[in-house]
C-alpha cells in the first residue's frame, strides 16, 4: 500500500517592510493564470535572497496570498494582483496561508518520509 | 530538466538586423517572466530586455530602447529578440533567462533569475 498524503494548512498575518527593491518576492496565480486547478488563487512563486521577505523569514514559496493590506485577493486578475502589490505602500500585511505537506503511511507502517527506516 | 536554448546568433555589420530565439523545456512555460541579457567580454552581465507572462507588459535598457523587440509564444514556449539598428556596441553574448511568476521587487538584475540559457554570440562589425 501506498502511503497518503495529506496537508496541514495554517494561516498567519505577516507584515513586511517595502525594501529598497521592493517586497522580494514573485507571485502567480489569478482568474487568468491558473497555478492550482480550480484555484484562481495568488501564490508565491520565489522567494529573493536578501529581498524583504526573505529578511523576513516566514513567507514561503508555495504560500498562498489571501489578503494585501486587508483587501481580498479572490477572483482578481494576475495583474491587477500585481498593481495591488506594487501599490499597497511602505508597511504592508499579508494574510498567509500556509500548506504543509505530511506524509502519512498506512495503520502500522511507517511513511516513505521518516527517516529513522 | 529545465532548459533554454538560445539561437539565432552570428556576425553582422552594423546597420543590420537579427532576431534571437530561446527555446524553454521543463518548465511551465506561461508562469514565467522572460528576459534578455548580454555580457561583453570583460564586463558584466547586462540586462537587455524583459517580458511578463502574457506578454502584455515589456521593458527595455535605455541603450537598445527603439531598436530591440522583445516577444513571446507561450504556445511554442519560446521567446525571441528581434534586434535592429545593430551597432558594434551590441558585439556581446545574448543570454535568455526566465523566473517563475511576476517578480514585486524588480526584473534587471541577473540574481531575479533562476534558469539560464547558455547563450549565442552576437558579433557587429
Known amino acids: 500500500m501506498n502511503g497518503r498524503v495529506d496537508y496541514l494548512v495554517t494561516e498567519e498575518e505577516i507584515n513586511l517592510t517595502r525594501g529598497p527593491s521592493g517586497l522580494g518576492f514573485n507571485i502567480v496565480g489569478g482568474t487568468d493564470q491558473q497555478y492550482v486547478s480550480n484555484d484562481s488563487g495568488i501564490y508565491v512563486s520565489r522567494i529573493k535572497e536578501n529581498g524583504a521577505a526573505a529578511l523576513d523569514g516566514r513567507l514561503q514559496e508555495g504560500d498562498k496570498i489571501l489578503s494585501v493590506n486587508g483587501q481580498d485577493l479572490k477572483n482578481l486578475l494576475h495583474q491587477d494582483a500585481v498593481d495591488l502589490f506594487r501599490n499597497a505602500g511602505y508597511a504592508v500585511s499579508l494574510r498567509v496561508q500556509h500548506r504543509l505537506q505530511v506524509q502519512n503511511g498506512p495503520i502500522g507502517h511507517r511513511g516513505e518520509g521518516d527517516p529513522s527506516g | 530538466e529545465v532548459q533554454l536554448v538560445e539561437s539565432g546568433g552570428g556576425l553582422v555589420q552594423a546597420g543590420d538586423s537579427l532576431r534571437l530565439s530561446c527555446a524553454a523545456s521543463g518548465i511551465t512555460f506561461r508562469w514565467y517572466t522572460m528576459a534578455w541579457f548580454r555580457q561583453a567580454p570583460g564586463k558584466e552581465r547586462d540586462f537587455v530586455a524583459t517580458i511578463n507572462w502574457s506578454g502584455s507588459d515589456t521593458n527595455y535598457a535605455d541603450s537598445v530602447k527603439g531598436r530591440f523587440t522583445i516577444s513571446r509564444d507561450n504556445a511554442k514556449n519560446t521567446v525571441t529578440l528581434q534586434m535592429n539598428s545593430l551597432q558594434p556596441e551590441d558585439t556581446a553574448v545574448y543570454y535568455c533567462?526566465?523566473?517563475?511568476?511576476?517578480?514585486?521587487?524588480?526584473?534587471?538584475?541577473?540574481?531575479?533569475?533562476?534558469?539560464w540559457g547558455q547563450g549565442t554570440q552576437v558579433t557587429v562589425s
Open positions: 533567462a526566465g523566473v517563475p511568476g511576476t517578480s514585486l521587487s524588480g526584473e534587471t538584475d541577473p540574481r531575479d533569475y533562476d534558469y
